[in-house]
Amino acid sequence: REEAKPYPLFPGPFPGSLQTDHTPLLSLPHASGYQPALMFSPTQPGRPHTGNVAIPQVTSVESKPLPPLAFKHTVGHIILSEHKGVKFNCSISVPNIYQDTTISWWKDGKELLGAHHAITQFYPDDEVTAIIASFSITSVQRSDNGSYICKMKINNEEIVSDPIYIEVQGLPHFTKQPESMNVTRNTAFNLTCQAVGPPEPVNIFWVQNSSRVNEQPEKSPSVLTVPGLTEMAVFSCEAHNDKGLTVSKGVQINIKAIPSPPTEVSIRNSTAHSILISWVPGFDGYSPFRNCSIQVKEADPLSNGSVMIFNTSALPHLYQIKQLQALANYSIGVSCMNEIGWSAVSPWILASTTEGAPSVAPLNVTVFLNESSDNVDIRWMKPPTKQQDGELVGYRISHVWQSAGISKELLEEVGQNGSRARISVQVHNATCTVRIAAVTRGGVGPFSDPVKIFIPAHGWVDYAPSSTPAPGNA
């Protein structure tokens, strides 16, 4: 169908406009590359050649003034559907006295170089040459919309044609589609949809879970306010114009929920007083994790069942649980939270601390000479069970003998049974300094405070013991 539209909705004067849905006269392949314009030489009308448009030089030049050169008026506005073909042209008659004329096509202020299908034909006469520059597009796209003009350079002057407005009409084209969102249950949120023609207007219908939301269409752009959801929903919008309808992508609106518990917990390392754990978070409930809680309780059935809670950041899914008892069994659970709340605790897992060296020294260390004066008797109390940090395997006794100019240190190992030891006198008329440490497989604990006893010369006996008091007995 062809229809004259004398004054379309574009600024500027036009002689007319054309709405066309017919295929072009020229079925040239639509290419995106560049190629030189085809031209027919006036001297050899049937043979195309490439190069600048050049009017054949005329030898005799008349002196009478020439009328101003101008492109002839042509169709000013062409409306057509997307993917159709179009051909338009501009024509001009140029006196033969002019040489080196070139015609170029411009769109929206930019020169169209190369492979747009531009053909220039020459029709020479005695005094003038009619030039028709044709431009064809075999399958128009939205990007072909715009204002096209011809320019001719002649003797350093530029002649510009009236614009030809190409309006490519098609199905609505989305410039803004709804976006997936994670929303709080029963809380209002907005979705936006915007589509453009031509042709305008574009009307919007909203669709929720395959059902239309609005009975009456809204002009684009449209904002849908959803008062709140209780479960996940899929929204899309339909954009309608005279050419038909386009449906946006469907977007999922998720309802934020409490997270799932972690799917894995790993015991990375254990020491006497700490356990390093890592975890793999569960599903986040459509809301980022904020922090995590590590719950620890003694696995011993005789324990009081109290739970220690360690809070940490959600990342890096790693935590060192500290201040634990040595050689103890623990149950560990991990829970993480998002803005909605805490996940359930993961299934409880078991972990143990290793043996450590005792954390305190033996108590009540007492040292005295026995009756024969050949030995020093040492007595002590074992460290409290909680502070042994393992199973006692024995004790290490350090005894230092000091007399004028002599100092001698000896170490003794004694078994775990009992709490006494006897050491031989090494030097008479000397001071013996005794310290004792408890030993587990985890190592040697701290030594007790030194206890000194004087060992007299032969024949002098002092039975008074030396001792370190037990804590609280001082």
């Epitope: 799917t263 894995e264 917990v265 790993s266 015991i267 990375r268 078991l350």
Partner: antibody
Framework: EQQLVESGGGLIQPGGSLRLSCAAS????????MSWVRQAPGKGLEWIGI???????YSASWAKGRFTISKDSSKNTMYLQMNSLRAEDTAVYFC??????????????????????WGQGTLVTVSS | DAQLTQSPSTLSASVGDRVTITCQSS????????LSWYQQKPGKPPKLLIY???DLASGVPSRFSGSGSGTEFTLTISSLQPDDFATYYC???????????FGGGTKVEIK
Amino acid sequence: EQQLVESGGGLIQPGGSLRLSCAASGFSLSSNAMSWVRQAPGKGLEWIGIISSSGSTYSASWAKGRFTISKDSSKNTMYLQMNSLRAEDTAVYFCARVGFFVGYGAYDYGIIHRLDLWGQGTLVTVSS
Amino acid sequence: DAQLTQSPSTLSASVGDRVTITCQSSKSIYNNNWLSWYQQKPGKPPKLLIYDASDLASGVPSRFSGSGSGTEFTLTISSLQPDDFATYYCAGGYSGDSDYAFGGGTKVEIK
């Protein structure tokens, strides 16, 4: 919808090799341990092995050496490579998601809490 | 290797009956409660029913219940329904061992 789909089963001659695949959808293998379980015709379930979310693998003692579990997280797919197949390996092979898993890295073992999602299974027949 | 022994291996019952299946472990289950029960129908994969010895999996009817700790566990169906005729497996893990052991199964059939 969360689901598991096994593939790669079929008829294989004794001594041959086969690779089974388990494609997961609706959840990520990067966040879940996965397991293989088999069931000989008319028999009970037999655990084959597990691959943790980080890619550590643990296998039943009978499966070590012949069966290898691996995964491609970018394809969200787990695999079971079976070598030196025998007639007694004839079974339906199921892949299953591990609902929770505890790993003891220092001791190189891990324990499954539960298998909460199963595939339909793929039949492997070893016969000459 | 630890073993799970289920009894009985076959059980004939009628709709409405109360059904009890036991599962005995040769050593203590991890954390004393990491035992699960699965239901399997012919030609179908197993389905998780119960975990942590007594917690019902999502979507499982309340007529199913589990109990026990350590080495002795029980699955009870309070009132057998037509949909419950199937084979039931217990399964669990153990400290110090990666193996996930399945019981031999109990087939619940129509009397």
